[in-house]
Amino acid sequence: MAEDFVSENSNNKRAPYWTNTEKMEKRLHAVPAANTVKFRCPAGGNPMPTMRWLKNGKEFKQEHRIGGYKVRNQHWSLIMESVVPSDKGNYTCVVENEYGSINHTYHLDVVERSPHRPILQAGLPANASTVVGGDVEFVCKVYSDAQPHIQWIKHVEKNGSKYGPDGLPYLKVLKHSGINSSNAEVLALFNVTEADAGEYICKVSNYIGQANQSAWLTVLPKQQAPGREKEHHHHHH
């Protein structure tokens, strides 16, 4: 990929320039929802220019979209996964060094022509750990045109068994979206005990389908106060 690494003689100072305009000819991208989009602006210059991205003329920040985005500097690319209608707009790459600046704009249209099941932000909920007596929060970021039903579920044991006679796991719904539930995307656990350790599942559904992701909670023993003898606790599960 010649356009990815452009080496210049250190004495030959040069403002940024495009190295592969063929890859930039398609300015309008109409993409079905939930697909991945990749915009490229292969460039060169000396010193090697930097690249930044704007959305609709303003700085494009990770928090501007669920799931964020990836920038592959060595490939001069911007990657957005699982695009949604709110991703529509103009995306401008700005490539600059001390000798100049160039830019190129792509227009993204997200074609949303069929209802779809919920999409969950990758990496959430995230694994967490806390000490006995501590507090912890799990977050599940959901995208769905149709506001989904959100459930927080934990695997539990009954009579020392994790599975019922039917071979299915014992599950407990800890929280679900509804009239009496505030901010169902967040599960807060307070004053945790070792029994709270385990897998927590965020399960969302709308009338099209479901999605679920899980995270693990590790509960650590409380640190002993300085100067005190270490206490011994034996736990049998």
Partner: antibody, heavy 113, light 108 residues
């Protein structure tokens, strides 16, 4: 192409059991709810319930809870609607639907003595 | 249960007319959680509009949907001969996913 194909028309007597089917093709069957909808002769649409084939999560309308059973066999991409004891009032066209956008052709169930 | 009340229950119109059908929910529902279907005699329902205002793929642009809260509207901007059918709204906010009773659009 994406489609749902339902089993053929049935003529049954009151008290008999019945299981009708809905086979999905052209898409990932486990990733969409299959809904069942009843339409009695000359009447409107009634939502009966739904199943998520991936984990067999099932939900019923209170009007149909205990009257019918919804199930699925994801290995053959097929959902089912069944009755253990039919009544004359079960005479209707029954549709399966993937979410909202893809519908089966319908199965006419006639219950008559 | 959330009840969906459609009006009118039937209407007569001519080709080229602008037709509006309304659906009222018995309680506030999310603006994105209503669908509109068209059904012709002996056929399965066909999705026209989903999530209140999104036109389903392949559906002519003369169909449009709008609304939020409790009131939802299906509009046919210029009625065509193939549009004579029965139209249903549906809420998908909460189980059971209830339908309206239907609006039959007949030729005047």
């Amino acid at each position: 192409q994406v489609q749902l194909v339902q089993s053929g028309a049935e003529v049954k007597k009151p008290g008999e059991s019945l299981k009708i089917s809905c086979k999905g093709s052209g898409y990932s069957f486990t990733n969409y709810y299959i809904h069942w909808v009843r339409q009695m002769p000359g009447k409107g649409l009634e939502w009966m319930g739904a199943i998520y084939p991936d984990n067999s999560d099932t939900t019923y309308s209170p009007s149909f809870q205990g009257q019918v059973t919804i199930s699925a066999d994801k290995s053959i991409s097929t959902a089912y609607l069944q009755w253990s004891s039919l009544k004359a009032s079960d005479t209707a066209m029954y549709y399966c639907a993937r979410g909202a956008d893809i519908w089966g052709q319908g199965t006419l169930v006639t219950v008559s003595s | 249960d959330i009840q969906m009340t459609q009006s009118p229950s039937s209407l007569s119109a001519s080709v080229g007319d602008r037709v509006t059908i309304t659906c009222r929910a018995s309680q506030d529902i999310d603006p994105y959680l209503s669908n509109w279907y068209q059904q012709k005699p002996g056929k399965a329902p066909k999705l026209l509009i989903y999530d209140a205002s999104n036109l389903q793929s392949g559906v002519p642009s003369r169909f449009s949907g709008s609304g939020s809260g409790t009131d939802f509207t299906l509009t046919i901007s210029s009625l065509q001969p193939e549009d004579f059918a029965t139209y249903y709204c549906q809420q998908t906010t909460s189980h059971p996913y209830t339908f309206g009773q239907g609006t039959k659009v007949e030729i005047k």
